[in-house]
Interface confidence: medium
């Protein structure tokens, strides 16, 4: 990679891309935008899906963490020939189908949707798109929109989680590269470390969870720290503090030495979780330590 910013978060990322007739001469720019962005999400626990829409929505690449499949998915994406109408809601339907399926399989992984379109959606199409985006949200997704050229920012603010979740690209398709850094920063939710990573058995502790994007939740009230103890019991705790780069969470009281708690974060009251490889372990502490 080029040493640019990267995201270490473990979640499910869906690209929903406009391939209607109006993007015919700009598909290369859309492709390179997605390719650049895809290579910056580098967690082995991150899964990705490519969905395109015009007069219907098509899942070009199903959700996968396999980097070889993602490479092949990008190759398929490059070959897309745009044409047809802007049925954005069809793209959201394809994402919701996958989210619903994953939830039904017992995976409660957080979902992030990045939807890109270039045109204003006419009355019915806007209504359908907003409805389907809400359905994705109800399944736990965070929705971002990228608007290029002739988009309606007010519409996109309704389809996305909020106006802060909209990335306007006013200078045409060639300017897409310019928002990679900001979209990565805003859409990335990652857990990087926990301090302390070792706690005393049987004692109360608070843990500072270091990371990024914790204030990206639609409602900071719904952020939770989750501790999966010895790969079995899961305890959720509301944080004392929710800041963009850290959470301050009460750690569960782990009674025995050698117990392990894997750390996850939910942005939606436990509907789904950002996974990490951060582990908190217990040790024996004497009275003086």
């Amino acid at each position: 990679e080029d040493g640019g910013p990267a995201c270490y978060g473990g979640f499910d990322l869906y690209f929903i891309l406009d391939k209607s007739g109006s993007v015919l001469h700009h598909w290369n720019e859309i492709y390179y935008f997605v390719e650049q962005l895809a290579h910056r999400f580098i967690s082995p626990q991150l899964r990705m899906s490519f969905i395109v829409f015009s007069t219907r929505g098509t899942t070009l690449m199903k959700l996968t963490e396999d980097r070889e499949q993602i490479r092949q998915g990008l190759e398929e994406l490059q070959k897309v020939l745009p044409g047809g109408d802007t049925y954005m809601h069809e793209g959201f339907e394809r994402a919701s189908e996958q989210i619903y399926y994953e939830n039904s399989q017992g995976y409660r992984t957080a979902s992030v949707i990045i939807a890109l379109t270039d045109g204003e959606l006419h009355e019915d199409l806007f209504f359908y798109s907003e409805r389907e985006a809400n359905r994705s949200r109800d399944l736990g997704a965070i929705v971002y929109c990228v608007g290029v050229k002739d988009f309606n920012e007010t519409q996109l603010a309704r389809i996305a989680d909020s106006k802060d979740h909209v990335f306007p690209v006013n200078d045409g398709f060639q300017a897409l590269q310019g928002i990679i850094h900001s979209i990565l920063k805003k859409s990335c939710i990652e857990i990087l470390a926990a301090e302390p990573s070792t706690i005393c058995a049987g004692e109360s502790f608070q843990v500072v969870v270091r990371g990024n994007g914790f204030r990206h939740a639609r409602n900071v009230d719904r952020v939770l720290c989750s501790f999966k103890i010895n790969d079995s019991v899961t305890l959720n705790e509301k944080p004392f503090a929710v800041e963009d780069t850290y959470l301050l969470c009460p750690a569960p009281i782990l009674k025995e030495v050698g117990m392990k708690a894997a750390l996850q974060v939910s942005m939606n009251d436990g509907l789904s979780f950002i996974s990490s490889s951060v582990i908190i372990t217990t040790t024996h502490c004497s009275d003086g330590s």
């Epitope: 959720n236 705790e237 004392f240 929710v242 009281i253």
Partner: antibody
Framework: QVQLVESGGGLVQPGGSLRLSCAAS????????MSWVRQAPGKGLEWVSL???????YYADSVKGRFTISRDNSKNTLYLQMNSLRAEDTAVYYC?????????WGQGTLVTVSS | DIELTQPPSVSVAPGQTARISCSGD??????VSWYQQKPGQAPVLVIY???NRPSGIPERFSGSNSGNTATLTISGTQAEDEADYYC???????????FGGGTKLTVLG
């Protein structure tokens, strides 16, 4: 709707003990951190103690070692056991639903420490 | 431990904008909540996480946080807004929840 009702306040001599209770209703009590906040007569608010949903406990330096916070999730009740009371502990004690903000408060119970 | 400093009092004419500040060295790192307390009543949360308004709180209440200062703004102040206002934040090295000293808002007239 959320309701928090404190009880157990009263007059106590310096060095004495008192146990405050806070009965909670209208929300899933065991999912929330809970806190005690006090206000001395004519003064500002002071955080006293907090217990997380998983029963981890935290105290302000001014009460550490003297006060104990606890909860009984089966009774939807929060407690504050106050020992070795001092004149400066005189205050209205509020129970509040907590976390990084106090979004619901009880009406408070007055604790007076005086000989 | 963090310390939050508020002006003891602020006066405003009805219909005007009241601004109450809350300053502290660590405020740039932490979000701030604001509480309104009327005489003989329990405090009420009016703003949390710098600028979020709980349901039921009028839109004239807003919050911001920049530099070393968080600000509670009440636009179109009404007589019923006369109360004590407290800011509250926390420390990232302990769960200590800290309150400012409080500001008495007087609505003139």
């Amino acid at each position: 709707q959320v309701q928090l009702v404190e009880s157990g306040g009263g007059l106590v001599q310096p060095g004495g003990s008192l146990r405050l209770s806070c009965a909670a209703s209208g929300f899933t009590f065991n999912s929330y951190a809970m806190s005690w906040v006090r206000q001395a007569p004519g003064k500002g608010l002071e955080w006293v103690s907090l217990i997380s949903s998983g029963s981890s406990t935290y105290y302000a330096d001014s009460v550490k070692g003297r006060f104990t916070i606890s909860r009984d999730n089966s009774k939807n009740t929060l407690y504050l056991q106050m020992n070795s009371l001092r004149a400066e502990d005189t205050a209205v004690y509020y129970c509040a639903r907590a976390g990084f903000k106090f979004d619901n408060w009880g009406q408070g119970t007055l604790v007076t420490v005086s000989s | 431990d963090i310390e939050l400093t508020q002006p003891p009092s602020v006066s405003v004419a009805p219909g005007q904008t009241a601004r109450i500040s809350c300053s502290g060295d660590s405020i740039p790192n932490y979000s701030v909540s604001w509480y309104q307390q009327k005489p003989g009543q329990a405090p009420v949360l009016v703003i949390y996480a710098d600028s979020n308004r709980p349901s039921g709180i009028p839109e004239r209440f807003s919050g911001s946080n920049s530099g070393n200062t968080a600000t509670l703004t009440i636009s179109g102040t009404q007589a019923e807004d006369e109360a004590d206002y407290y800011c509250q934040s926390y420390d990232n090295t302990s769960p200590d929840l800290v309150f400012g000293g409080g500001t008495k808002l007087t609505v003139l007239g």
